[in-house]
């Protein structure tokens, strides 16, 4: 089993919420969970993270809650726009560092 | 007792495709989790894809690996059904094809989280 793991697509309509579960091995416990956008040159912007940052993209409409009992951690992304469709990671220590799972996320 | 019957397997060529279908009617199927599992000759049964949906218009689309880019899953909450759109088939894709539903969502690659199963529709893909 790959270390982390997810919905490779998620559909939804604007307006909605979603909530992406990541799912993660025992020995990932206590590292940095976080959310990031995949830019068009590749790199992979951080939105949300465990450590409690929160981009202003995201203030007030999105909470990532870890679960370290079950192995998961939640990104809850409210008042979905089509803006907010594109290329998304869940991921697991530092950004880049390839222990992430791509998500697309159509709105 | 609650049944979940799949269908649309058989004998195709590589680089072919089958739509597998299962049905659900005993289900309150829109608050399930729907999975799709397979088992060649000898080999453990394994995870292939899988659906959830919220009730509210959104869906959730995991697949595994060896099917990502190849194999659609969808769901028809209407008709109490889940698909299986598998194309560019090998090979090695050859097994038996389970449908199951659950509704623990946990990891949905994890086989014993299903309590609910088919019997199977083989796919046979000839070189």
């Known amino acids: 089993k790959s270390p982390i793991f997810g919905p490779e697509e998620v559909n939804s309509v604007e307006g909605n919420s979603v909530s992406i579960t990541c799912y993660y091995g025992p020995q990932y416990a206590s590292y940095r969970k976080y959310w990031c956008r995949q830019g068009a040159r590749g790199g992979c912007i951080t939105l949300i993270s465990s450590e409690g940052y929160v981009s202003s993209k995201y203030a007030g409409r999105a909470n990532l809650t870890n679960f370290p009992e079950n192995g998961t951690f939640v990104v809850n992304i409210a008042q979905l726009s089509q803006d907010d469709s594109g290329r998304y990671k869940c991921g697991l220590g530092i950004n880049s560092r390839g222990l992430s799972f791509d998500v697309s996320l159509e709105v | 007792e609650v049944q979940v019957v799949e269908s649309g397997g058989g004998l195709v060529q590589a680089g072919g495709s089958l739509k597998l279908a299962c049905a659900a009617p005993?289900?309150?199927?829109?608050?399930?989790?729907m999975g799709w599992f397979r088992q060649a000759p000898g080999q453990e049964r394994e995870f292939v894809a899988a659906?959830?949906?919220?009730?509210?218009?959104?869906?959730?689309?995991y697949y595994a690996d060896s099917v990502k880019g190849r194999s659609t899953i969808s769901r028809d909450n209407a008709k109490n059904t889940v698909y299986l759109q598998m194309n560019s088939l090998k090979p090695e894709d050859t097994a038996v094809y389970y449908c199951?539903?659950?509704?623990?969502?946990?990891?949905?690659?994890?086989?014993?989280?299903?309590?609910?199963w088919g019997q199977g529709t083989q796919v046979t893909v000839s070189s």
């Open positions: 199951a539903a659950t509704t623990v969502l946990t990891d949905p690659r994890v086989l014993n989280e299903y309590a609910t």
């Open positions: 005993g289900l309150t199927f829109s608050s399930y989790r």
């Open positions: 659906i959830d949906w919220n009730g509210r218009g959104t869906y959730y689309r």
